[in-house]
Amino acid sequence: ETVHCDLQPVGPERGEVTYTTSQVSKGCVAQAPNAILEVHVLFLEFPTGPSQLELTLQASKQNGTWPREVLLVLSVNSSVFLHLQALGIPLHLAYNSSLVTFQEPPGVNTTELPSFPKTQILEWAAERGPITSAAELNDPQSILLRLGQAQGSLSFCMLEASQDMGRTLEWRPRTPALVRGCHLEGVAGHKEAHILRVLPGHSAGPRTVTVKVELSCAPGDLDAVLILQGPPYVSWLIDANHNMQIWTTGEYSFKIFPEKNIRGFKLPDTPQGLLGEARMLNASIVASFVELPLASIVSLHASSCGGRLQTSPAPIQTTPPKDTCSPELLMSLIQTKCADDAMTLVLKKELVAHLKCTITGLTFWDPSCEAEDRGDKFVLRSAYSSCGMQVSASMISNEAVVNILSSSSPQRKKVHCLNMDSLSFQLGLYLSPHFLQASNTIEPGQQSFVQVRVSPSVSEFLLQLDSCHLDLGPEGGTVELIQGRAAKGNCVSLLSPSPEGDPRFSFLLHFYTVPIPKTGTLSCTVALRPKTGSQDQEVHRTVFMRLNIISPDLSGCTSKG
């Protein structure tokens, strides 16, 4: 029997469904267990105009150590503000710097990506190491890339249509899923049905879909049924803020007691059949009907409460209009460049327009120093000797002042350049964790403590330790201590910084062979990164220290020898 229920799009204020999925339009996952470099490639397609993207890289420690180095190749078709999170991961990022703008300094090694089409980009990436994963994503809002998770059956990665990236990649599309609703004819009462249909994915392994349901009603006002239909290998974990009738395929459990699995039902796998099911359960309204690709997390927000259903005949706007200029975000887009004894501020007009800001002026603290309009950007430049620059031993400071139409008072932001000629970086070796007495001698089997300092200190910049290694000459080889701001091996520990913010770490050295080297060179690459502002101001230096090695010890921990 045909169920009369004319599904129509529901306005976002009545119901919205967002989801996270590992299904991609094209993709592949491969195994490259012996590769030194883990290579991942993302092709990201955005609609015209700048977009915001949150990209998180997550690594699970394997055998107590961080994973091998990672190359992430980011190919985008239009401007993107990127918020990158890759804490402690030895990451190399290849991207097109004219299209990708970081919301904060990425603190990773970067490489300019050649302007190649997909085939050549894949080859360019593969030249650096076997590709572990590659994916094409359409208008992502956020991406989670899990490293060291590749479960591919093949040793090579070849883009194929409609792939499931498994645990390697999960992403959230910017556009919410299409939510439709309808009135079930001939059913009295106020019971509402929320129907979620998860379509089969490319891989048929067991899956748990977390369904978060948020209905904005007083608990007593609601008479509802949640119908969840999916392929047989899908079970459900339900996290709802209301009591409701549950009708699912497979098995389901509740977030509050996840270990208690409840057997579901055999449900029809067509929209008509599911509408019939809702009717059979005495629902008078289908408040939301959603079909999704195989997802890992689905969030349903609805505000129907069994009331009158409002459908929107016109195409619905999937993102709320953003007509107000955000001064904070605007100020974060000012790029500071320091070169040739001059400070240059750059503000790209395309980004300004995207924030719906109208700029009436950009100056330094001295209002007579105004920005030049260079077509696609505003450029404000001044020598360190003018425009009210404040010159200290370590830094040149000023203020960027932006007048915007929507604000009566100007926006201000401190801008800085480092006075590199006056800065000196020192490595200090200590024999105790109190960092009191410096030494130039290490003893195998005894912990050594290292601190890096910059003087004079620079409060607006963060001193970070990017990498360190100990060169023990031809007999001893090289011992990697820190890589990608993460400790390498069990015998290296990153310690809390000094009260002044100086990075510290400790290491323990052992030798298994003789002769033991008598000297070594500790070499560290440090970075000064602005606490706020752009990565253009990052400064890198390599600092060396000659060490003496005393007293043999043939037991123990990590070394090369």
Epitope: T119, A126, F156
Partner: antibody, heavy 118, light 112 residues
Framework: QVQLVQSGAEVKKPGASVKVSCKAS????????MHWVRQAPGQGLEWIGN????????FYDEKFKGRATLTVDTSISTAYMELSRLRSDDTAVYYC???????????WGQGTTVTVSS | DIQLTQSPSFLSASVGDRVTITCKSS????????????LAWYQQKPGKAPKLLIY???TRESGVPSRFSGSGSGTEFTLTISSLQPEDFATYYC????????FGQGTKLEIK
């Protein structure tokens, strides 16, 4: 000068495997992609796959995935193409060709005739 | 996959003639970021390996005579031989390298 020299003709039975070699000289072997292309009698050119000797990375055409295996031995600057589970329609001339990023397939081997017949 | 269709499949001409071979692509092979067409032309003589003539749709490979020229953009391309020489009688293939690698079915140029 750049040269790609392939192994000699092969006659195989259906179901068997064949391994064709391609020795490169006159350039840095590890810096260029090596591609394999075949041509059945009286037919056009068909791309099989490619390998980057510097990293060992490979790509294959969907049609040959799982049946063709590309490998290299960088110590002797030689690329190999192995095709398994041979069928009579695999009878063709197999070419190795170097791809220059800018210009394309700029140097080709002389070709290896593989005949599959029971 | 991008399919390439060449026409004609066979072509008879005489020495000194001007000859045009067309290649149509099922999708554009123009890469917008660098405005280059990822299409090449090869010449193959019986019993020999193919030889690169043209790349980026219109750039002649070094050592290729100036009578060979390539033109077109997007999905329609032509190879023109302005004045046929005896050594030009061969089979010609177009080849796209924008999305993986595919070849046209070939155009056999014979002496009339």
């Amino acid at each position: 000068q750049v040269q790609l020299v392939q192994s000699g003709a092969e006659v195989k039975k259906p179901g068997a495997s064949v391994k064709v070699s391609c020795k490169a000289s006159g350039y840095t072997f590890t810096s260029y992609w090596m591609h394999w292309v075949r041509q059945a009698p009286g037919q056009g050119l068909e791309w099989i796959g490619n390998i980057y000797p510097g990293s060992g990375s490979t790509f294959y055409d969907e049609k040959f995935k799982g049946r063709a295996t590309l490998t290299v031995d960088t110590s002797i600057s030689t690329a190999y193409m192995e095709l398994s589970r041979l069928r009579s329609d695999d009878t063709a001339v197999y070419y190795c060709t170097r791809r220059n990023y800018v210009t394309g397939f700029d140097y080709w081997g002389q070709g290896t005739t593989v005949t599959v017949s029971s | 996959d991008i399919q390439l269709t060449q026409s004609p499949s066979f072509l008879s001409a005489s020495v000194g003639d001007r000859v045009t071979i067309t290649c149509k692509s099922s999708q554009s092979v123009l890469y917008s970021s660098n405005q280059k067409n990822y299409l090449a032309w090869y010449q193959q003589k019986p019993g020999k390996a193919p030889k690169l003539l043209i790349y980026w749709a219109s750039t002649r490979e070094s050592g290729v005579p100036s009578r060979f020229s390539g033109s077109g953009s997007g999905t329609e391309f032509t190879l023109t031989i302005s004045s046929l020489q005896p050594e030009d009688f061969a089979t010609y293939y177009c080849h796209q390298y924008l999305s993986s690698y595919t070849f046209g079915q070939g155009t056999k140029l014979e002496i009339k």
